[in-house]
Interface confidence: low
């Protein structure tokens, strides 16, 4: 098998799938201590490309709740408060890591998974295709 | 304590820190197969609140490379292509999960960590405080 040199304080892994399977401590260390707790919380309403937040819940996933942004309009809000369809509201997406229970319903066994989430919306100039 | 009904095929955990420590399979399952690979790639330039992407690299973290958005202007770009300071470009932030090696240099032991990243920028109406 594979013999691994390690820090003497490393946990041992007797799992037959090692090294594909590792130990992960779920006591989350939060590096965001100095951030404003309000953060982007009101931007979804004040943006010229406002969005609604939809709750995506999956008990077999960690985190089990993820908030998905859906742009409210195809266009953007202009200075008069009306929707300007010469501009486009588009979602800003990001790939994030989540943990998925595998096999399902196992309390202590997960697989890393990448999912794409929409975090918010931004207003962009449309790409116009001219027909000859 | 809490009794968790589990799938009979679940791996057992003899770890004394269980259930804080779990097994995670690192063969990442990517759920984004049907997404447009271009995704938000050109929005950073076309947005009325454009942003630059800065590479944040940390080899002791997974993912080791994270791209951070920094808004280019305090204001937003208007229809004439000029910066309008009556509006504000603001970062849309999201808390994401990453894995950090712990103890350092252990090949099979990690801790989940939450970090706050700026994914892109959006244009918002400023909050104006009127002085009496």
């Amino acid at each position: 098998g594979i013999t691994i040199p390690r820090n003497p304080g490393c946990p041992n892994s007797e799992d037959k799938n090692f090294p594909r399977t590792v130990m992960v401590n779920l006591n989350i260390h939060n590096r965001n201590t100095n951030t404003n707790p309000k953060r982007s919380s009101d931007y979804y309403n004040r943006s010229t490309s406002p969005w609604n937040l939809h709750r995506n819940e999956d008990p077999e996933r960690y985190p089990s709740v993820i908030w998905e942004a859906k742009c409210r309009h195809l266009g953007c809000i202009n200075a008069d408060g009306n929707v300007d369809y010469h501009m486009n509201s588009v979602p800003i997406q990001q790939e994030i890591l989540v943990l998925r229970r595998e096999p399902p319903h196992c309390p202590n066994s997960f697989r890393l998974e990448k999912i794409l989430v929409s975090v918010g919306c931004t207003c962009v100039t449309p790409i116009v295709h001219h027909v000859a | 304590g809490i009794t968790i009904p589990r799938n009979p095929g679940c791996p057992n955990s003899e770890d004394k820190n269980f259930p804080r420590t779990v097994m995670v399979n690192l063969n990442i399952h990517n759920r984004n197969t049907n997404t447009n690979p271009k995704r938000s790639s050109d929005y950073y330039n076309r947005s009325t609140s454009p942003w630059n992407l800065h590479r944040n690299e940390d080899p002791e973290r997974y993912p080791s490379v994270i791209w951070e958005a920094k808004c280019r202007h305090l204001g937003c770009i208007n229809a004439d292509g000029n910066v309008d300071y009556h509006m504000n470009s603001v970062p849309i932030q999201q808390e994401i999960l990453v894995l950090r090696r712990e103890p350092p240099h252990c090949p099979n032991s990690f801790r989940l960590e939450k970090i706050l990243v700026s994914v892109g920028c959006t244009c918002v109406t400023p909050i104006v405080h009127h002085v009496a």
Partner: nanobody, 119 residues
């Protein structure tokens, strides 16, 4: 483009020595933990040694402790493995690998250099 090029392998008698080198390019070498990994004929991969970014800490598989020394020269983007008191069981292809957070999912490998220990 990331490149890792190993050299220094060859045929050596039991008890002999070899020094393997790995020239790295295309990434910030000093930011990454680096590894030597080997694969003996018909066997799986075995992690031999690893070294911290600044060279301050080294780790070895038990079977090579006291015989092998891993080192690096960040100024020259180079990784080394000094192998002394070689044994027949050290015969393998030796690979240098760039370490990511998940070290056995190396994103980049060299082409390897063959070390044969035989009388």
């Amino acid at each position: 483009e990331v490149q890792l090029v190993e050299s220094g392998g060859g045929l050596v008698q039991p008890g002999g020595s070899l020094r393997l080198s790995c020239a790295a390019s295309g990434f910030t070498f000093s930011s990454y933990q680096m590894y030597w990994v080997r694969q003996a004929p018909g066997k799986g991969l075995e992690w031999v040694a690893s070294i911290k970014q600044d060279g301050s800490e080294e780790y070895y598989v038990d079977s090579v402790k006291g015989r092998f020394t891993i080192s690096r020269d960040n100024a020259k983007n180079s990784l080394f493995l000094q192998m002394n008191s070689l044994r027949a069981e050290d015969t393998a292809v030796y690979y240098c690998a760039k370490g990511e957070i998940l070290p056995l999912y190396f994103d980049y490998w060299g082409q390897g250099t063959l070390v044969t220990v035989s009388s």
